[in-house]
């Protein structure tokens, strides 16, 4: 099973220069339970919600959003009406957060390419995202790698050789930037919270098997949301309007009720039991 990926694409409509569309998609095996689109930054980290889409309950959208809709079972689009003459959308970062079962919550941000022609935009280039359950391994291997690298550095310095620069295998500038950022962020997340993994975040004792739409609980410690350069609007190398951040933990806020995640399982911010917050979440 491949690691989930999220892509974001922002484009200006060819017919109306004041009209923009944000496209977001989730590439992963899980079922999507909620999508949140925000602007000005990630949801819960300075961003303002523009729309929330639930696959069965419907959508909720707020100005300047004009129409939020599902394009496929794993992608959405959000049309925006730019009423201002100064076209503020052109310099804005748009973020899409996909909550999925069983992967958790994944968020990506993107902005309109600075010199893009109306109606044109590069195809989304998803970058591999690191699963939280790899973060612990990466954290440990990162320390070991750093140690080995440092020893190597000392040895080479003694031989008066220049330090070799490690390059990722990708040549795409987006991939280079995002990939270079992702491992360090994931490692930090693992060091900050070694329990932020999918496998250890449920409370098995509270799984509800009595109803098809039952609930399970999620400990608050799994709600860590690393933020990094990919959350910033000023990432000049990411010029084509689409980039991907690392997996951002599970559900963003410990006190926030997460979405309905699929048959027989939903996550809660604590372990009070399946009826602690009965029903299903959604924002229309």
């Amino acid at each position: 099973a491949g690691t989930p990926e999220v892509w974001v694409q922002v484009q200006m409509e060819a017919t109306e220069l004041s009209s923009f569309t944000v496209h977001c998609g989730f590439l992963g095996p899980g079922s999507i339970s909620l999508v949140t689109v925000s602007w000005g930054g990630p949801d819960g980290a300075g961003g303002t919600k523009l729309a929330v889409l639930h696959p069965e309950l419907g959508t909720r959208q707020w100005a300047p959003a004009r129409q939020a809709r599902w394009e496929t079972q794993s992608s959405i689009s959000l049309a925006l009406e730019d009423s201002g003459a100064s076209s503020p959308f052109a310099n804005t970062t748009f973020c899409c957060k996909f909550a999925s079962f069983p992967e958790g919550s994944w968020e990506s941000c993107g902005s309109l390419p600075p010199s893009s022609d109306p109606g044109l935009s590069a195809p989304p280039t998803p970058v591999p995202i690191l699963r939280a359950d790899l973060a612990g391994i990466l954290g440990l291997s990162g320390v070991l790698l750093f140690g080995c690298g440092y020893l190597l550095h000392l040895l080479r310095r003694q031989k008066h050789r220049p330090t070799p620069r490690l390059q990722p295998s990708h040549t795409n500038s987006q991939a280079l930037t995002a990939q270079a950022w992702a491992p360090s962020q994931a490692s930090q997340a693992a060091l900050h919270d070694p329990y932020a993994t999918i496998n250890t975040s449920f409370c098995p004792a509270t799984l509800d098997t009595a109803h098809p739409n039952g609930w399970a609980s999620l400990p608050t410690h799994a709600a860590h949301q690393p933020q990094g350069p990919a959350a910033s609007a000023s990432t000049p190398i990411l010029a084509r309007g689409s980039f991907v951040s690392v997996e951002n933990g599970l559900y963003t806020q410990a006190g926030e009720r997460p979405p309905h995640t699929g048959p027989g399982l939903t996550l809660f911010p604590d372990c009070r039991g399946p009826r602690a917050l009965e029903g299903r979440f959604g924002v229309r």
């Epitope: 419907g58 707020w62 809709r69 599902w70 806020q253 229309r284």
Partner: antibody, heavy 114, light 113 residues
Framework: EVQLVQSGAEVKKPGSSVKVSCKAS????????IEWVRQAPGQGLEWMGE????????NYNEKFKGRVTITADESTSTAYMELSSLRSEDTAVYYC???????WGQGTLVTVSS | DIVMTQSPDSLAVSLGERATINCKSS????????????LAWYQQKPGQPPKLLIY???TRESGVPDRFSGSGSGTDFTLTISSLQAEDVAVYYC?????????FGQGTKLEIK
Amino acid sequence: EVQLVQSGAEVKKPGSSVKVSCKASGYTFSSFSIEWVRQAPGQGLEWMGEILPGSNSTNYNEKFKGRVTITADESTSTAYMELSSLRSEDTAVYYCSSYWFAYWGQGTLVTVSS
Amino acid sequence: DIVMTQSPDSLAVSLGERATINCKSSQSLLNSGNQKNYLAWYQQKPGQPPKLLIYGASTRESGVPDRFSGSGSGTDFTLTISSLQAEDVAVYYCQNAHSYPPTFGQGTKLEIK
């Protein structure tokens, strides 16, 4: 446990205003919409509008635009619905709701009578 | 606005029998992108707020007995109670969850025959 607790019944004169409150608990108030729905005696349900407390973004039913104002106070996790220029037809039970109408307040009866 | 029309306005069914309520929308509630129907059903008992029963046209809300089921697509939907119980006496509403503003049907009053 998610709870929406509304203010008590009100009797108002035609032409006046009423402000109904809805205190939310059991979830992050700022993250999700609070909807307002009204139900006249023996009648159906009518959506009035909504607010997203985190950003105070609102959507209103065109029918009530100009007469209804929905606000929210994050510090107290309370949403408010104010209806002005009241007339007898506004006599109804007013409900607040959240999570796509999965959770509801107990309702507030507003009676408009001279 | 999408107009929701329910039929019948009232219905009397014997205990243990099947009850069927229909709902028709003036526009399709089907999203072609993900092939989901955005329709919900509510139950309201006297003096109480409505209670969500079904969403997505056919998904039962948590805790709702399995005698309640929803079906339909596009503009025509049905709520079925397979075996009527005394506690099912209530008014039932369908609701457009597809587009703004959310609109409700006029309601169907279900009684015991």
